[in-house]
């Protein structure tokens, strides 16, 4: 059922990376517009993206209020130019999204190696602590602030002349690894949340190699 020429949204999908969270859906509207509502399981519905012809809605501002909550969204369809019109049951046509818990489900963004410094046969590799849109006391929190020790980084490192990748892990943003003196090494990092069963890993960071500008060398 529903208003003539109005179709319900479908394929509602959460797209979320480092808590930047967008709800996407289909179809592209023909003579209709959409409004999105979002709520926690126990909360009130809040409307966003009013009467839009887009098929996405940025819900980041809502979910960052409490990333450990579980959210539900719904997309209402209205005839273009007649947004007061309702379906046969006296309500606008709408479709519910899957539930979404940002803390458990947001994808981990590609990390970046901030710097590496060699001192003798040790190299300190530092991973950039990316800022998120999650706030506390009016300041934006970093990924480490939000996830704490739940977030680990895996470092892959290898001699420039070799293919075998050694690994190291840290629950901070720094690695201290042993290297052979006089050898150049390359590095790549991956963010991991081991307690998860889905969306556990980020993509790998860009590879950085010794002898390039990010590094420092000290005897």
């Amino acid at each position: 059922s529903g208003t003539t020429n109005t179709v319900a949204a479908y394929n509602l999908t959460w797209k979320s990376t480092n808590f930047k969270t967008i709800l996407e859906w289909e179809p592209k509207p023909v003579n209709q517009v959409y409004t999105v509502q979002i709520s926690t399981k126990s909360g009130d519905w809040k409307s966003k993206c009013f009467y839009t012809t887009d098929t996405e809605c940025d819900l980041t501002d809502e979910i960052v209020k409490d990333v450990k909550q579980t959210y539900l969204a719904r997309v209402f369809s209205y005839p273009a130019g007649n947004v007061e019109s309702t379906g046969s049951a006296g309500e606008p046509l709408y479709e519910n999204s899957p539930e979404f818990t940002p803390y458990l489900e947001t994808n981990l963004g590609q990390p970046t190696i901030q710097s590496f410094e060699q001192v003798g046969t040790k190299v300190n590799v530092t991973v950039e602590d990316e800022r998120t849109l999650v706030r506390r006391n009016n300041t934006f929190l970093s990924l480490r602030d939000v996830f704490g020790k739940d977030l680990i980084y895996t470092l892959y490192y290898w001699k420039s002349s070799s293919s075998g990748k050694k690994t190291a892990k840290t629950n901070t943003n720094e690695f201290l690894i042993d290297v052979d003196k006089g050898e150049n090494y390359c590095f790549s990092v991956q963010a991991v949340i081991p307690s998860r069963t889905v969306n556990r890993k980020s993509t790998d960071s860009p590879v950085e190699c010794m002898g390039q500008e990010k590094g420092e060398f000290r005897e």
């Epitope: 892959y156 690994t167 892990k169 629950n171 081991p194 069963t197």
Partner: antibody, heavy 120, light 107 residues
Framework: EVQLVESGGDLVRPGGSLRLSCAAS????????IHWVRQAPGKGLEWVGY????????YYADSVKGRFTISADTSKNTAYLQMNSLRAEDTAVYYC?????????????WGQGTLVTVSS | DIQMTQSPSSLSASVGDRVTITCRAS??????VAWYQQKPGKAPKLLIY???FLYSGVPSRFSGSRSGTDFTLTISSLQPEDFATYYC?????????FGQGTKVEIK
């Protein structure tokens, strides 16, 4: 339920080749690291190598480097150990094991093992 | 590579005995040490991770401790099902390495 099942073990002549499989169920291998570990008859555990199926990165023990290759097919949720130029000292039960990539990351889950015998 | 030197290689004990097995790492491995139990014809089973944390489902008579680069597995009161071979493993760096194993036999 997390399960790892190895297969492909056989009797093979020195210099021969063999491919072992490690079929995973109950989890997605690309989210984890898969290791191969072997145990010669009456001996201890020896680490062979690992693969991170998400990026294809590998590392091998010196004793097998250049002869063994680990690969993974994420569509089949299976890791492989290709063994070439086999020697008598490669005779062992071969296990695959899952590493959850946590900081503590021990080998939490192991397969039942598959026996490789290299003999003329 | 980091060497894990495990001792003793074998020991004989009776049910109810307190058993201690040690592993010494050739260099610092922080707490990245695990202990496994293996019975004949079976795959190893994880007992202890991060040097002292008991893995889920493992009886509390098993415990692990660390002192610098020395790691200890203790079985407070040996039970009949504990007769097996025990291995330590470091996973602080690649390659991960195992101790030589300790076979716990019935006296």
């Amino acid at each position: 339920e997390v399960q790892l099942v190895e297969s492909g073990g056989d009797l093979v002549r020195p210099g021969g080749s063999l491919r072992l499989s490690c079929a995973a169920s109950g989890f997605t291998i690309s989210y984890y690291i898969i290791h191969w570990v072997r145990q010669a008859p009456g001996k201890g555990l020896e680490w062979v190598g690992y693969i991170d199926p998400s990026n294809g990165y590998t590392y091998y023990a010196d004793s097998v480097k250049g002869r063994f290759t680990i690969s993974a097919d994420t569509s089949k949720n299976t890791a492989y150990l290709q063994m070439n130029s086999l020697r008598a000292e490669d005779t062992a039960v071969y296990y695959c094991a899952r590493d959850d990539q946590s900081v503590s990351s021990p080998f939490e889950y192991w397969g039942q093992g598959t026996l490789v015998t290299v003999s003329s | 590579d980091i060497q894990m030197t495990q001792s003793p290689s074998s020991l004989s004990a009776s049910v109810g005995d307190r058993v201690t097995i040690t592993c010494r790492a050739s260099q610092d491995v922080n707490t990245a040490v695990a202990w496994y139990q293996q019975k004949p014809g079976k795959a190893p089973k994880l007992l202890i991770y991060s040097a002292s944390f008991l893995y889920s489902g493992v009886p509390s008579r098993f415990s692990g401790s660390r002192s610098g680069t020395d790691f200890t597995l203790t079985i407070s009161s040996l039970q009949p099902e504990d007769f097996a071979t025990y291995y330590c493993q470091q996973h602080y760096t690649t390659p991960p390495t195992f101790g030589q194993g300790t076979k716990v036999e019935i006296k």
